[in-house]
Interface confidence: low
């Protein structure tokens, strides 16, 4: 066959679907690779062809669209499974072509099993709720396009294994689940099961997401530098190791970039000649507040190093702060015998 623009295997779109449930998969060509949509392509006389490679096989095969009850079908740029089977797992290719043009892309589809409590190897989206922030909602994801608006599905919500009924602060409202006041105890996996009829059959869509309760913007503050502070003096003799921790607390802020850095005499450590190393560690609270520690280390400090200015800086979307460390050279202890002798007038 003639040359075809091959976009390869698009592993960025690792599609996972549950076994024995409907799945609708759009050809990624129009969403991510081409500068026109399916309608434009179709009206220009281009044809969309689907084929697949089974798991652990190298052979590309056409997709069988003549299965009983139209189990697999194509509608415009969507490949439909009604429903999926475990052995539908494989790499699927959609190819757009006519006599002069050809473009194709492959993507992996994994059909996964779930247990009675919705546990599975499915990668779960994470939805963050602010702690004690008033009513917040999550919506049953990725159910658009499965049934027409005239169909009224039934939706059942679960937290972990348990149907959400008579929960104190969590109320199912159709496709939405409302949290009256989110608390740490609301952390967990939430599943909506959408049941709808189609051509005399009943289908189920299972969607699970992880809820993580995080710090509220109402409580957010600019970065707080716990160390260095005014109470600790780093007193060293030349030749000793100088270790100064910079410990900074950051309130959780959605999409904020938290930064900590040191300056020595106003310059970044990379821009000066002294042999300095910086080690960083990060820890998080249950509400994803962050504590960053950067330890500045000079293995063998010189008397010049002990005269420099060491400043810890921190920045978040809430503001920027800085704090200088108190560094000084240790005064040598008096040589006791000599001073004693001098005190008695000895020469």
């Amino acid at each position: 066959s003639e040359r075809c623009d091959d976009w390869g295997l698009d592993t960025m779109r690792q599609i996972q679907v549950f076994e024995d449930e409907p799945a609708r998969i759009k050809c990624p060509l129009f969403e991510h690779f081409l500068k026109f949509n399916y309608s434009t392509a179709h009206s220009a006389g281009l044809t969309l062809i689907w084929y697949w490679t089974r798991q652990d096989r190298d052979l590309e095969e056409p997709i069988n669209f003549r299965l009983p009850e139209n189990r697999i079908s194509k509608e415009k740029d969507v490949l439909w499974f009604r429903p999926t089977l475990l052995n539908d797992t494989g790499n699927y290719t959609c190819m757009l072509r006519n006599t002069t043009y050809c473009s194709k892309v492959a993507f992996p589809l994994e059909v996964v099993q779930k247990d009675s409590c919705f546990n599975s190897p499915m990668k779960l989206p994470v939805h963050k709720l602010y702690i004690e922030y008033g009513i917040q909602r999550i919506t049953c994801p990725n159910v658009d396009g499965y049934f027409p608006s005239s169909v009224k599905p039934t939706i059942t919500w679960y937290m972990g294994c348990y149907k959400i009924q008579n929960f104190n602060n969590v109320i199912p409202e159709g496709m939405n689940l409302s949290f009256l006041i989110a608390l740490i105890s609301n952390n967990g996996n939430y599943t909506c099961v959408v049941t709808y009829p189609e051509n005399g059959r009943t289908f189920h869509l299972t969607r699970t997401l992880t809820v993580k309760v995080v710090g509220s913007p109402k409580n957010a503050v600019p970065p707080v530098i716990h160390s260095p502070n005014d109470h600790v003096v780093y007193e060293k003799e030349p030749g000793e190791e100088l270790l100064i921790p910079c410990t900074v607390y950051f309130s959780f802020l959605m999409d904020s970039r938290n930064e900590v850095w040191w300056t020595i005499d106003g310059k970044k450590p990379d821009d000066i000649t002294i042999d300095v190393t910086i080690n960083e560690s990060i820890s998080h609270s249950r509400t994803e507040d962050e504590t960053r520690t950067q330890i500045l280390s000079i293995k063998k400090v010189t008397s010049e190093d002990l005269k420099r200015s060491y400043v810890c800086h921190a920045r978040s979307a809430k503001g920027e702060v800085a704090k200088a460390a108190k560094v000084k050279q240790k005064v040598p202890a008096p040589r006791y015998t000599v001073e004693l002798a001098c005190g008695f007038g000895a020469t």
Epitope: D115, N119, S120, P121, L124, C161
Partner: antibody, heavy 121, light 113 residues
Framework: EVQLEESGGDLVQPGASLRLSCAAS?????????MCWVRQAPGKGLEWVAC????????IYYATWAKGRFTISKASSTTLYLQMNSLRAEDTAVYFC?????????????WGQGTLVTVSS | DIVMTQSPSSLSASVGDRVTITCQAS????????LSWYQQKPGQAPKLLIY???TLASGVPSRFSGSGSGTDFTLTISSLQPEDFATYYC?????????????FGGGTKVVIK
Amino acid sequence: EVQLEESGGDLVQPGASLRLSCAASGISFSSSDFMCWVRQAPGKGLEWVACIYAGSSVSIYYATWAKGRFTISKASSTTLYLQMNSLRAEDTAVYFCARSTGSVGRGFNLWGQGTLVTVSS
Amino acid sequence: DIVMTQSPSSLSASVGDRVTITCQASQSVYNSNHLSWYQQKPGQAPKLLIYSASTLASGVPSRFSGSGSGTDFTLTISSLQPEDFATYYCQGEFSCVSADCIAFGGGTKVVIK
């Protein structure tokens, strides 16, 4: 040849910590593999410890007795760990790593040869 | 806690004998059939014989068979061979949220009469 190999077993004192590793060769864990640790005390039966879905970081399960002291984790598509803290004499056992492929309910079709952990003062 | 009770705990048999081992779970296994059987010889790792209560694992001789559903299961060796003298374990899989995911039976040691 497809195999799992455990390492890290040792003689330690009560209260100590130990990290066991399980390295896969000839395969890498697929996202639907259920990777587990199972132990066997000398002369006794098999006892489940913990499991993790290879394709997930949230689907982690522990035996009731192991919660809090033992941590299962996965470093890559070929390495599984078991971090054991506050070890007790009754944790003395051969620790096996085992894989259940592609589906729940299919049993553990691949086992390592085991690594011996002895907790004694 | 889930308990898997295997019986007998040991049995003496001769080559050619038909051997039956039972396994009872204190609650139904997931999907009524998520039960596996293993064979273990001294100093070796367990070997999968049967999964999904009755499906023979790859490479396992057809003299081994499994049956049962829910809480009661049976492993049968139709004609015991010299290499079959070993310890046999059942293993159930359960809903991970309400209980331990996995539990093993105490084992049945098959020895030469």
